[in-house]
């Protein structure tokens, strides 16, 4: 599946995807989050704060087609993809440009869906088969959630709603991602 288009407004259009875009590859394996570091306790963050400026969980608009077997939605649907590193990130002086830069602080927070919405889509099928209707779950908003370690199982906890919203008015710094990584992120999902 190749890219059909790549827009500059953080909206990717990809043909014939299933119900969900996938989480970024770094979220795909819970083993990285199941290590019993620090005796199974989250590391101490001396600068842990709920200041919204320290979180970079952002919502990217993503347009895709919904598929079910050989059938494809007549129109693409638009939803959000949760992206960015969740804090508590420490704002540290940038020696080069006197600005600030983000330093992610490990896998203790994750930018994941907070709310979903349902949308009914009409799927067109080949070979004269009757159209199908499907109700799909679409990401409606994203949030930083804290990871706690619990019997070596990963568990996501809400982090205060004031830190949950993507930063308005701040241009997010895009992470360098290869086309291959993006492709892995956006494979068929249901």
């Amino acid at each position: 599946q190749g890219w059909q288009a790549f827009k500059n407004d953080a909206t990717e259009i990809i043909p014939e995807l299933g119900e969900y875009p996938e989480p970024p590859p770094e979220l795909e394996n819970n083993k990285t989050m199941n290590r019993a570091e620090n005796g199974g306790r989250p590391p101490h963050h001396p600068f842990e704060t709920k200041d919204v400026s320290e979180y970079s969980c952002r919502e990217l608009h993503f347009t895709r087609y919904v598929t079910d077997g050989p059938c494809r939605s007549a129109k693409p649907v638009t939803e959000l993809v949760c992206s960015g590193q969740c804090g508590p990130a420490r704002l540290l002086p940038n020696a080069i440009g006197r600005g600030k830069w983000w330093r992610p602080s490990g896998p203790d927070f994750r930018c994941i869906p907070d709310r979903y919405r349902a949308q009914r889509v009409q799927l067109l099928c080949p070979g004269g088969e009757a159209p199908r209707a499907r109700k799909v779950r679409l990401v409606a908003s994203c949030k930083c959630k804290r990871l706690t370690r619990f019997h070596n199982q990963s568990e996501l906890k809400d982090f205060g709603t004031e830190a949950a919203r993507p930063q308005k008015g701040r241009k997010p710094r895009p992470r360098a991602r290869s086309a291959k990584a993006n492709q892995a992120e956006l494979e068929n999902a249901y």
Epitope: A118, K135, V136
Partner: antibody, heavy 116, light 111 residues
Framework: QVQLVESGGGLVQPGGSLRLSCAAS????????LSWVRQAPGKGLEWVSV???????YYADSVKGRFTISRDNSKNTLYLQMNSLRAEDTAVYYC??????????WGQGTLVTVSS | DIALTQPASVSGSPGQSITISCTGT?????????VSWYQQHPGKAPKLMIY???NRPSGVSNRFSGSKSGNTASLTISGLQAEDEADYYC???????????FGGGTKLTVL
């Protein structure tokens, strides 16, 4: 073909812990939401927990704070860590694949008995 | 809590049609076409029979059909056969799309 195989059930005392596993094959595991559903002996189906493909987790009130759902996409395996078990948790536990907001494939189930 | 209510039992003779109802609050059945139906034989795992009110997965007989009126969804089985004898459960999801609820189940007896 799609297959879900649960394991890890058994006899445990009240207050004890147990971890269930569900090995999946025949589909792109990481792309699907997955649930645990249980059925007490002679009773109906009860939804327990679901995990999204992003790793977000949700629970029935009856198990919140005691059970933890997780997934390992590298192993195509779903887990349910059950702590502080009670007699009323005795049931057959099924893992089920969630596609388009319904459960299209189910495992054969694993029996958990909580008794002293 | 949201609840789905089903009759405890229904029965019918071979060749007849029967209908199993599933009644819920507007937030889980009435406002959204999201009811699915599962068949469960004794000692076996549930099997999806109907989803999104009236869609049949491939491999499920066209004798099974679903419908919805107001806040009541229904499963109709026509041309009843002995192998249809089983428990049937309706299911829906919560408004958040992140929780599910099952009806109490209906035992179908083929006389």
């Amino acid at each position: 073909q799609v297959q879900l195989v649960e394991s890890g059930g058994g006899l445990v005392q009240p207050g004890g812990s147990l971890r269930l596993s569900c090995a999946a094959s025949g589909f792109t595991f990481r792309s699907h939401w997955l649930s645990w559903v249980r059925q007490a002996p002679g009773k109906g189906l009860e939804w327990v927990s679901v995990i999204g493909n992003w790793g977000d987790t949700y629970y029935a009130d009856s198990v919140k704070g005691r059970f933890t759902i997780s997934r390992d996409n590298s192993k195509n395996t779903l887990y349910l860590q059950m702590n502080s078990l009670r007699a009323e948790d005795t049931a057959v536990y099924y893992c089920a694949r969630d596609t388009y907001l319904h459960f299209d494939y189910w495992g054969q189930g694993t029996l958990v008995t909580v008794s002293s | 809590d949201i609840a789905l209510t089903q009759p405890a039992s229904v029965s019918g003779s071979p060749g007849q049609s029967i209908t199993i109802s599933c009644t819920g609050t507007s937030s889980d059945v009435g406002d959204i076409n999201d009811v699915s139906w599962y068949q469960q034989h004794p000692g076996k795992a549930p099997k999806l029979m109907i989803y999104d009110v009236n869609n049949r997965p491939s491999g499920v007989s066209n004798r099974f059909s679903g419908s919805k009126s107001g806040n009541t969804a229904s499963l109709t089985i026509s041309g009843l056969q002995a192998e249809d004898e089983a428990d049937y459960y309706c299911s829906s999801y919560g408004e958040s799309l992140t929780s599910y609820v099952f009806g109490g189940g209906t035992k179908l007896t083929v006389l």
